[in-house]
Structures are given as C-alpha cells and as structure tokens.
C-alpha cells in the first residue's frame, strides 16, 4: 500500500470515543504520553485529535481496480509532533514524537463500519485494528470481515468547533 501524495487530502479535528461512548484521553506522564479509555464527567472537556487523511493505492495484486483502487489512510495526532503508532510486536498503540515523513507505523487504513463510526487498521499489519482492551488502546487481530463490526474496534468521531490543536 503506497501513499499517493505526501500531503493529506484533508484534515479533521475531532474528539475520539469508543462505540459505548467512553472518551479516548491523552496524558503527559514522565515525559511520555499515556493513552486512556475512560468515562468523562458531564462537563469535562474531551481531548481532540487531528486526523489527517491520505489517499493510498491498493497493491496491484490485491485489487482489479486500477486507478480506482484507492483507500483512505489516516494519521492521528493529539498534540503537536506526536502521533499514534502501531507497535505490532507488543500489540500496543503508543504515542511517539516523529518528524515527517512519518513512519508506516503511524498510518492506519480507515474503515467505515457504520455511517457514524470508524475503525483503524494498521498499515504495517493488515487485519490488525486499534481496539479497546482493559481500558487502554491495543492492537486487536480481526480474523474476518464478519468480526469487523465487533464493538471494541469501533470508534466515533465527534466534531469540534476549535480549529487549532494544542
């Protein structure tokens, strides 16, 4: 899967929550960021994530689509210069400081399972998705398309009216 352009086709600032409405939050601890999945209090402010959308071409052996075989890939950045990364060895999702061009571990194939929810498939490990495990984000292997609707890999993006990210 190759990214067809070095610039995102669009960027979108949103808060990220699980399918059962827990918020994804980010906390700086001991000079590194931790990612949490938690219930927020009623008026507690949701953390925002900058989603950058890139077009990507299917590998030619995977698709008969030719120029039509495009997918969307996203990178997720909750704060400047930090991006979510897939650590495929540890089956974990981590926040790392990176410079552009970002490594492949920072890219996720965007899936819409429902009209109002998305899933993120690791570019570096097809069939492995960001999911929720023990109140943390983790990489979860999904065996077949029948399991793609499993709720622990579904996330909601809710719009925000702020146009900068901290």
């Amino acid at each position: 899967m190759s990214i067809t352009g070095i610039s995102p086709i669009t960027e979108y600032l949103a808060s990220l929550s699980t399918y059962n409405d827990q918020s994804i939050t980010f906390a700086l601890e001991d000079e590194s960021y931790e990612i949490y999945v938690e219930d927020l209090k009623k008026d507690e402010k949701k953390d925002k994530v900058l989603l950058s959308y890139y077009e990507s071409q299917h590998p030619s052996n995977e698709s008969g689509d030719g120029v039509d075989g495009k997918m969307l890939m996203v990178t997720l950045s909750p704060t400047k210069d930090f991006w979510l990364h897939a650590n495929n060895k540890e089956h974990s999702v981590e926040l790392h400081k990176s410079e552009k061009p970002l490594p492949d571990q920072a890219f996720f194939v965007l899936h819409n399972m429902h009209s109002n929810s998305v899933s993120f498939e690791s570019k570096t490990d097809p069939g492995v998705f960001i999911g929720v495990k023990d109140n943390h984000l983790a990489l979860i292997k999904v065996d077949s398309s029948e399991n793609l609707s499993t709720e622990n890999i579904l996330f909601k993006l809710s719009e925000t009216h702020h146009h900068h990210h901290h």
Epitope: D65, M71, V109, N112, H114
Partner: antibody, heavy 121, light 106 residues
Framework: EVQLVETGGGLVQPGRSLKLSCVAS????????MYWIRQAPGMGLEWVSS????????YYLDSVKGRFTISRNNAENTVYLQMNSLRSEDTATYYC??????????????WGQGTLVTVSS | DIQMTQSPSVLSASVGDRVTLSCKAS??????LDWYQQKVGEAPKLLIY???NLQTGIPSRFSGSGSGTDYTLTISSLQPEDVATYFC????????FGQGTKVEIK
C-alpha cells in the same frame, strides 16, 4: 473499466413492488460501500439507501424506511433495491453508485446510467 | 439531519467568465463535501471530493474551497461543455444533496 448496470425499472401500479438490480464489474466489489440515489423527473438528486462492504449495515432515507430494502451479493457482484408499497412520489430514475474509496462511506466515485421507475395507475 | 442549500438556482454567464457556485450546510460538515456535475440526459459525475480535491480526469479550471458550513465551487474560465447542473453533497453525517445550480451560457 468500472461498470455499473442497473436493471428492473418499469411501470408499476401504486402499492405494488419492484426489485432493482445493479451488476458491478471492473473493481473489487466486496471492498466498497454501495448506494442507491434517485432523481424524480426534472428534479434534483436524492440519496435513498446505503450498504456497507459486507452487507451488515444498511441505511435509508426516512420516506422509504420500512418499504425499501437494500441488499448485496458479493459473490455475484450485485446490489439490489427491493421496493414495496410503491407510491407515485417514488417515480424517478434510480442510480446505483459505488464508494470512492475501499472500505469508506465517503463520496460516490462512479455511477451507473440509471433505471426509470414509474409508479402510476 | 443536515440540510444543504445551494445558490443561485440558475446561473447564466459568458464563455471565459469566472463562475462561483455556493453551498451552505445547516451544520459544520468538516469539509466532508463533494461536487457532482450532471449534464442533460447523463448520470452525475464526481468532480471534487473532500471540498477541494479534483477527481482524476476533471479539468483544472474546476476548483473547490470552504470549511465549516460554507463551500464554493469555482470554474475559472467557463467553457461550453460546462453547461450542466451542479450538486453539492455532504457525507459528514448521513448523506444529503443540495438542490442544484443550473449553469447556462449567455
């Protein structure tokens, strides 16, 4: 080359049923959301229904909910629209469309030529 | 539900003119907006997606811009073959078309 060919349109009386089919070729059908969009004579476009890649999630325009059913057969590269209890206001050209991106419900990347449904007594 | 309102309904301009079509959403749609062109007797065709990305094969005289609730399609130099109806379309929340703008040559 991507192709979408709709069939099944025609003249039908109010209250009767009709089933539209759309046969797809030139792309990996099971990777794409599929859609039905309609256009009443001389009017604008109106989204009618959507179905995700594996057929597990379907969506409908409020005015057709409970009357229309979208489905797909990925083995046969075909998407269907079963239309029951048809009304005169359902008269339109019905277009089949495919998503612009694999796996994503964004944009209609390609459209068929449409099939005309006329509901009249 | 999100409503999409296009203006004007009909636009008449001369060949070579710069033409601007407007589309307004009832809520913020986060640039999740397309423009489709439909010529008489033909199926619609995707022109621009995600607000400002030109579909493969579409002439560069077409461009899109906007954010939040306000979006614009611009034809930098109107050509006779651009006579068509143009529809905006949002997919941020559900799927909704605008009512269309018909572009004619004076």
């Amino acid at each position: 080359e991507v192709q979408l060919v709709e069939t099944g349109g025609g003249l039908v009386q109010p209250g009767r049923s009709l089933k539209l089919s759309c046969v797809a070729s030139g792309f990996t059908f099971s990777n794409y959301w599929m859609y039905w969009i309609r256009q009443a004579p001389g009017m604008g476009l109106e989204w009618v229904s959507s179905i995700n890649n594996d057929g597990g999630n379907t969506y409908y325009l409020d005015s057709v909910k409970g009357r229309f059913t979208i489905s797909r057969n990925n083995a046969e590269n075909t998407v269907y629209l079963q239309m029951n209890s048809l009304r005169s206001e359902d008269t339109a050209t019905y277009y089949c469309a495919k998503g612009h991106y694999s796996y994503s419900s964004y944009s209609f990347g390609y459209w068929g030529q449409g099939t005309l449904v006329t509901v009249s007594s | 539900d999100i409503q999409m309102t296009q203006s004007p309904s009909v636009l008449s301009a001369s060949v070579g003119d710069r033409v601007t079509l407007s589309c307004k959403a009832s809520h913020n749609i986060n640039k999740h907006l397309d423009w489709y062109q439909q010529k008489v007797g033909e199926a619609p065709k995707l022109l621009i997606y995600f607000t400002n990305n030109l579909q493969t094969g579409i002439p560069s005289r077409f461009s899109g811009s906007g954010s939040g609730t306000d979006y614009t399609l611009t034809i930098s130099s109107l050509q006779p073959e651009d006579v068509a109806t143009y529809f905006c379309f949002q997919y941020n929340s559900g799927w909704t078309f605008g009512q269309g703008t018909k572009v004619e040559i004076k």
